[in-house]
């Protein structure tokens, strides 16, 4: 059986696959997924290994029309480095010489300057090029190699291994060499895989059942450390509760060097955030941190300094802490917008069982603003999801120059932010450089400001506008209002009407359904339309909603189904990557972010059309 990293190299023109007959003969044969000799896999960013021989594809020289055969894998050899060129060409790195079928006289696969159909290769059974099944470095744990990546294949006691092994062990623990010759270099680490006993790599907090892995002997950059945690279905550490910090202070007390945690300010337009999307509500900075020096965007926990946090350059090499298991957040169920009949008094705006109102003109200090909201039967607003924030920005009449009190504050316990309405903190969205909590002026209250409505801590005594929120009163069955310019069941936003397509459909089916409604799969022109759509679909239980974006027409170039320029994107992390496909919006914790899916997957969708009676604004000229 093929494991997910292995593939057959297929030439569509001949309908045949590459076959490693022997190390000196790499030819083609009728494709057979059970033949070991036809299985290959990437073993570094640029090397392809034959699974049968545990040797790498290479050439004797970078010249036209030489045979491609198998060599002992050598990550430094220029003659074993391959790269995908445009579309389905595979070439030797840095040259216009391609992996080629050969010809009638030449049965062997050859290196050739021609880029025609005989030089075009796909993964058998797919339409993808060979790089779509690319190499993913596997970071080791413990051992003696400072967390370096596995080197496949590696030699141990004169035998080659292309995977983690338990050779030399009687307990089944899986390990790998971190250089190609363990026998000479003696460098190794344990693999971040599940095996009997691997749970002893983790410390479980008996109070919360959350597990932590302290990798104090590793030396990785922040991004590498994060990848290592993710390879174990975990994330870099987030700390949202005082108890959690206390537990980790104890766990790391015998250590001295800094350890990466998930806190970072890598997002271009927002502030400090946890990589696992936990809310940043508890602060434990080392005095003098976070320093405002550019580039110091990642955070380490300092065991030698009472486990306090310090921001550093992300390329520094440190140990790290991973976290997995039940989140430390209280379970707090936010009702989906469609589940709650929402009736609000005049001048209040309904959303997901609550009513909201901006008080912009009567500026008040935080304490007085809170009193006013409570007199009106509510509280300063709490915000629990990106959808709720996007509702406030896109539909409450929020303005880019607003600075408005919300209910978040750390008045009760310093450096521990809570909502004034007592609801749990499940979400935060800080402005770049925030929360700054400047010591020379007590910044215990929080405002929403700027075009995106992100947050900043502020001295509570400033007179500002504020946002109130209260529970709505249910009044029997909800009356479906027909919005002006839109048909029944459609929702209006600015000049457009939107409708959720409730049938699970492929991208093509969804597009057709929208067309049948004299509409099209939604385009997303800017941050504000994105905010509206996030609040429109983000709380729904389905995972994805199709948009009109895809690279069906030209691989690698994403276009809307209607002739409109792509002027705004909102990709999820690691997207769009190299995957061709169609774009859907995520819901839930990654609400609104765009993922590339296979176009024949089934999802719900959003249709869009011009509202009636709206004058089309002129198209922007470029």
């Amino acid at each position: 059986l093929l494991d997910t990293r292995q593939f057959l190299i297929y030439n569509e023109d001949h309908k045949r696959c590459v076959d490693a007959v022997s190390p000196s003969a790499v030819q083609t044969a009728a494709c057979n997924q059970d033949a070991e000799s036809q299985k290959f896999r990437w073993v570094s960013e640029s090397q392809i290994m034959s699974v049968a021989f545990k040797l790498c594809l290479g050439v004797p020289s970078k010249t036209d029309w030489v045979a491609i055969t198998l060599y002992a894998c050598d990550s430094k050899s220029e003659f074993q480095k391959w790269e995908c060129k445009n579309d389905t060409l595979l070439g030797i790195k840095g040259e216009d010489l391609f992996f080629n079928y050969g010809n009638r006289q030449e049965k062997n696969i050859m290196l050739y300057k021609g880029s025609g159909l005989w030089s075009r290769w796909k993964i058998y059974g797919t339409t993808d090029n060979l790089c779509s099944r690319g190499y993913e470095a596997m970071y080791t744990l413990l051992g003696n190699a400072n967390g370096a990546t596995c080197a496949f294949p590696f030699k141990f006691e004169n035998k080659w291994y292309a995977d983690c092994t338990s050779a030399g062990r009687s307990d089944g623990w899986l390990w790998c060499g971190t250089t190609t010759d363990y026998d000479t270099d003696k460098l190794f680490g344990y693999c971040p895989l599940k095996f009997e006993g691997s749970e002893s790599l983790w410390n479980k907090d008996p109070l919360t059942s959350v597990s932590y892995q302290i990798n104090s002997k590793s030396a990785l950059t922040w991004h590498q450390a994060r990848k290592s945690c993710q390879q174990q279905n975990a994330e870099l550490l987030s700390i949202t509760e005082i108890h959690e910090q206390t537990y980790l202070t104890g766990l790391t007390s015998s250590l001295t060097s800094g350890l990466w945690i998930g806190l970072n300010s890598l997002s271009f337009n927002s502030g400090w955030q946890w990589s696992d999307r936990s809310p940043f509500r508890y602060l434990n900075w080392l005095p003098g941190s976070p320093s405002a020096e550019p580039g110091k965007s990642c955070v380490s926990l300092n065991p030698g300094k009472n486990a306090k946090w310090e921001n550093l350059e992300c390329v520094q090499k440190l140990g790290y802490i991973c976290k997995k298991g039940n989140t430390t957040l209280n379970s707090f169920v936010i009702p989906s917008e469609s589940d709650v009949p929402t009736h609000c008094p005049s001048q209040w705006w309904p959303y997901a069982g609550h009513c909201y109102k901006i008080h912009r003109d009567e500026k008040k200090i935080q304490r007085d603003a809170l009193t006013t909201c409570r007199k009106e039967g509510g509280d300063l607003t709490s915000i629990h999801t990106i959808e709720e924030l996007d509702f406030i920005i896109s539909q409450l009449g929020y303005e880019p120059n607003d600075e408005l009190w919300i209910g978040l504050n750390d008045i009760k316990i310093q450096m521990y932010f809570e909502w004034s309405d007592g609801t749990p903190v499940t979400f935060t969205k800080w402005l770049r450089g925030e929360p700054s909590h400047e010591n020379n002026r007590q910044e215990d209250c929080v405002v929403m400001k700027g075009k995106d409505g992100y947050w900043a801590d502020r001295g509570c005594e400033w007179p500002l506008g504020y946002i109130c929120k209260m529970k709505s009163r249910s009044q029997g069955p909800e009356i479906v209002e027909v919005e002006k310019g839109c048909r029944k069941g459609w929702k209006k936003h600015h000049f457009y009407c939107y409708m959720i397509g409730h049938t699970l459909s492929t991208f093509a089916e969804a597009n057709q359904t929208c067309n049948n409604e004299n509409a099209y799969l939604t385009t997303i022109e800017d941050r504000y339309e994105q905010a509206f759509l996030t609040s429109f679909v983000g709380l729904r239980p389905e995972k994805y909603f199709w948009t009109g974006l895809s690279d069906i027409q030209t691989k690698g170039t994403f276009q809307w189904t209607i002739e409109e320029e792509v002027r705004f994107t909102h990709w999820n992390s690691d997207m769009p990557g190299r995957k061709p496909g169609c774009v859907a919006m995520r819901t839930g914790i990654a609400g609104g972010l765009w993922d590339v899916l296979k176009c024949d997957e089934k999802a719900k969708f959003v249709c869009k059309h011009w509202a009636e009676g709206v004058t089309h604004p002129p198209k922007p000229t470029t």
């Epitope: 413990l142 051992g143 050779a167 062990r169 009687s170 307990d171 623990w173 190794f188 002893s200």
Partner: nanobody, 119 residues
Amino acid sequence: DVQLVESGGGLVQPVGSLRLSCAASGSIFTINAMVWYRQAPGKKREEVAAITRGGSTNYADSVKGRFTISRDNAKNTVYLQMNSLKPEDTAVYYCKAVVVTTTPYSDYWGQGTLVTVSS
């Protein structure tokens, strides 16, 4: 690297008792199992008792009910309490630790301690 030191062997009369201990030291991350073996003169080495990191135990049929294996995780030490000893228990007793350490090899052996059961 990893060192194992056994102690507690000696001469004992039949039906008497002895307590063997085996202490592991060195660069050990965790000990997944500790096992006692014995080898009588002219015979093959045989497993006597084993204990895992989680505390599960296993005994050879010939010692069940007479021998008890236990461990002290904090001290990286395993004990073998031997009661109702018989002359056929005479052997060199070896301790093996299955460890996670700074080499990929897992099995480390002690030098052995001699137990003689004789009147």
